[in-house]
Interface confidence: low
């Protein structure tokens, strides 16, 4: 009762909101809401009624399974969707689906904040720039991942000659997509000409 399921999808995709269990037998009424009381569609044993909402024309209800199909979801569709079923007994049952719609991440730009030759070692500070997104960062040196504690938007490290890498890659990802940006250096410690 009231169990919350999380779902993450990419914007522009078509989504099916459904529950993992079968609907109560011979239910009287089924209603899908977004937020707690905004009706999307209601089925009452005869027909489906679609309500005036931002979803009108983009949704379809399957009364058999209770599944709600939404086409071309956008970030504005982020919400908790609630399916409420009124049983013949008069009791109510509800299921919640928290839908998170994410845009595909854009390709990141690597900015060289500082590059300095220090006693035959190379001090490197790179930032991975991506506009206003909540993403995960993974840094690679010549395709080898840096340690986990270095994984954020800024890579700051001092490399000894035996650890020099020629190219540094920042991979940004969210749960629906991933993109890479790469910058290459000339040994021992200068930016390569592009």
């Amino acid at each position: 009762q009231g169990h919350l399921v999380h779902m993450t999808v990419v914007s522009g995709s078509n989504v099916t909101l459904n529950i993992s269990e079968s609907l109560p037998e011979n239910y009287k009424q089924l209603t899908w809401f977004y937020t707690f009381d905004q009706k999307i569609v209601e089925w009452d044993s005869r027909k489906s009624k679609y309500f005036e909402s931002k979803f009108k024309g983009r949704v379809r209800l399957d009364p058999q399974s209770g599944a709600l199909y939404i086409s071309k979801v956008q970030k504005e569709d982020n919400s908790t969707y609630i399916m409420r079923v009124l049983k013949k007994t008069g009791n109510e049952q509800e299921w919640k689906i928290k839908l998170q719609v994410l845009d595909p991440v854009p390709k990141p730009v690597i900015k060289i904040e500082k590059i300095e030759d220090m006693d035959d070692n190379c001090y490197l500070k790179l930032s991975c720039v991506i506009p206003g997104e909540s993403v995960n960062y993974t840094w690679y040196g010549d395709k080898r991942p840096f340690p986990k504690e270095l994984q954020n938007s800024v890579l700051e490290t001092t490399l000894m000659p035996h650890n020099y890498s020629r190219c540094y890659t920042c991979q940004v990802s969210n749960s629906v997509s991933s993109k890479n940006g790469t910058v290459c250096l000339s040994p021992p410690c200068t930016l390569a000409r592009s």
């Epitope: 009231g2 937020t35 707690f36 009381d37 309500f51 005036e52 009791n91 509800e94």
Partner: antibody, heavy 118, light 108 residues
């Protein structure tokens, strides 16, 4: 006949607490969402809180969020509103009302008066 | 949130007269999700109209509702002595549910 009977109101000092109850009869209580609506003396109506029939979902007006808790005991056909950190502006008659399919309120109880004053 | 403005604030009328109460919304009320309630002194509100124009169970047919979008009206075709009260409109098309400030219908 559907009946709703509120109780638990009274005089309380600012910062104090109260618990309101609403005893329901005449309908399958667990099948319906319930709400609290308040009315300050001489003023209009303000929706306060909502709870789904199962009790699994609760919602609050911004003015009471974090201070009020709505809950229900379907075995006792009773709705509750726990109020803490009460302020003078919470003074009102508190009505419980049956939510008709998350739309309008019908019927309402007779109300219980809460007065917050030092 | 949708703000509902009722007018006039007070109406002084005699029994038998026709009454028209107005409720204007700050933005369109979805699918005419508007209700009207009657409240007498010392009593709880009572549902009169829902869906802008449907009469609730047991409400006399002298009460009627109309309107859509942002403009709604409650009409009492012929005032009875028991109709003197405060009338509230309420929208349930979007969250949070909101009420108008009320119109008082008093005896002249």
């Amino acid at each position: 006949e559907v009946q709703l009977l509120e109780s638990g109101g009274g005089l309380v000092h600012p910062g104090g607490s109260l618990r309101l109850s609403c005893a329901a009869s005449g309908f399958t209580f667990g099948g319906y969402a319930m709400s609290w609506v308040r009315q300050a003396p001489g003023k209009g109506l303000e929706w306060v809180s909502l709870i789904s029939g199962s009790g699994g979902s609760t919602y609050y007006a911004d003015s009471v969020k974090g201070r009020f808790t709505i809950f229900r005991d379907n075995s006792k056909n009773t709705l509750y509103l726990q109020m803490i950190s009460l302020r003078a502006e919470d003074s009102a008659v508190y009505y419980c009302a049956k939510y008709s399919n998350y739309d309008y309120f019908d019927p309402w109880g007779q109300g219980t008066l809460v007065t917050v004053s030092s | 949130e949708i703000v509902l403005t009722q007018s006039p604030g007070t109406l002084s009328l005699s029994p038998g007269e026709r009454v028209t109460l107005s409720c204007r919304a700050s933005q369109s009320v979805s699918s005419s999700y508007l209700a009207w309630y009657q409240q007498k002194p010392g009593q709880a509100p009572r549902l009169l109209i829902y869906g802008a124009s449907s009469r609730a169970t047991g409400i006399p047919d002298r009460f009627s509702g109309s309107g859509s979008g942002t403009d709604f009206t409650l009409t009492i075709s012929r005032l009875e002595p028991e109709d003197f009260a405060v009338y509230y409109c309420q929208q349930y098309g979007s969250s949070p549910r909101t009420f108008g400030q009320g119109t008082k219908v008093e005896i002249k």
